[in-house]
């Protein structure tokens, strides 16, 4: 496969601690700044449930235990999940809403059990998109998908 630069990248896997919080940072390329960004849950793309979506501005949007904030200057949007539960473990997507062809990348979320009673200050972990923006056939790493309102892969080496 010829190397293709993906339009959106995110961490392949993130790990949180039960009752703590985790932060995922997804990076997008130039041109997508003003588009809506979202965080969706479910491995089957077309049936994944959007948990939170930006309003098109940089203002933080929060719904239940999940928040999303877009930094258009840095072309990064940040998703935070708080008060984590074991049942939060699943396949999620960082995505950008675009008519006809959404952009998205899968993020696998795992939750480790809290070994001690709930801390007074919840544990917080941040995960950022990998620096690599290009994939080659020698590296079988998923860094980005291009979606057509269901699974639509742009590049998987």
């Amino acid at each position: 496969d010829a190397s293709i630069v993906t339009q959106i990248t995110g961490p392949t896997t993130v790990n949180g601690l039960e009752r703590g919080s985790l932060t995922v940072q997804c990076v997008y390329r130039s041109g997508w700044e003003t588009y809506l960004k979202w965080w969706c849950r479910g491995a089957i793309w077309r049936d994944c449930k959007i948990l939170v979506k930006t309003s098109g501005s940089e203002q933080e949007v929060k719904r239940d235990r999940v928040s999303i904030k877009d930094n258009q200057k840095n072309r990064t949007f940040t998703v935070t999940m708080e008060d984590l539960m074991k049942t939060d473990a699943d396949t999620y997507w960082c995505g950008i809403e675009k008519t006809g062809n959404d952009l998205g990348v899968t993020v696998q979320v795992t939750i480790d059990p809290a070994s001690t009673p709930a801390p007074t200050t919840p544990t917080s972990t941040t995960f950022t998109a990998p620096v690599t923006q290009e994939e080659t056939s020698s590296s079988p790493t998923l860094t980005g998908h291009h979606l057509d309102n269901r699974h639509k892969l742009l590049k998987l080496s």
Epitope: L147, H151, L156
Partner: antibody, heavy 119, light 112 residues
């Protein structure tokens, strides 16, 4: 190239258990859910459900809840379909299938595993 | 469950003829995201099914342009403009909009 290779034909008695394998190659196994499809002799196709190949969480169509179990051996890039307490109506060819992001359809299929149930 | 009904059950054709297969769903298969996940598969004897059309009218890569899909809501059609010998087999429509996903009963395309 991407391949899904299934285990060979099975001959089992009613009441027994069978486990069919589907070994994936040519792609990162945990990035794509695996689906299972049943085809009874001379009949059409029936979607059985799928398994999240990262988390191992299965989803079953109503007709396949109970005696059917999807599982994984991630280190071997292999998905399994186990059928317990076999019945005559389980006699069929079972396919594993991968849905591709781009195609919006099942564009990679295993070759099928024929299960014969006979006393 | 969404019932997918295909007609005809069997379709005898001469090579070079046009063939048309109908698929009707028992309810609308427009997904909540606005897309219609209607696919067509061809299964030849002793083989696995092969994807022809996805999302009603999109030809999968490598599928000849003599295959075309159309329709909306509950009524869908697969057309083969000039049937070739390699097109013979059983055609299935499939809806992936509502769980459980369901296949049609199949249409056997055979030589007249």
């Amino acid at each position: 190239q991407i391949q899904l290779v299934q285990s060979g034909p099975e001959l089992e008695k009613p009441g027994e258990t069978v486990k069919i394998s589907c070994k994936a190659s040519g792609y990162t196994f945990t990035n794509y859910p695996m689906h299972w499809v049943k085809q009874a002799p001379g009949k059409g196709l029936k979607w059985m459900g799928w398994i999240n190949t990262y988390s191992g969480v299965p989803t079953y169509a109503d007709d396949f809840k109970g005696r059917f179990a999807f599982s994984l051996e991630t280190s071997a890039s292999t998905a399994y379909l186990q059928i317990n307490n076999l019945k005559n109506e389980d006699m069929a060819t079972y396919f594993c299938a991968r849905m591709d992001y781009y195609s919006n359809g099942f564009n990679y299929w295993g070759q099928g595993t024929t299960l014969t149930v006979s006393s | 469950d969404v019932l997918m009904t295909q007609t005809p059950l069997s379709l005898p054709v001469s090579l070079g003829d046009q063939a048309s297969i109908s698929c009707r769903s028992s309810q609308s298969i427009v997904h909540s995201n606005g897309n219609t996940y209607l696919e067509w598969y061809l299964q030849k004897p002793g083989q696995s099914p092969k994807l022809l059309i996805y999302k009603v009218s999109n030809r999968f890569s490598g599928v000849p342009d003599r295959f075309s899909g159309s329709g909306s809501g509950t009524d869908f059609t697969l057309k083969i403009s000039r049937v070739e010998a390699e097109d013979l087999g059983v055609y299935y429509c499939f809806q992936g909009s509502h769980v459980p996903w369901t296949f049609g009963g199949g249409t056997k395309l055979e030589i007249k």
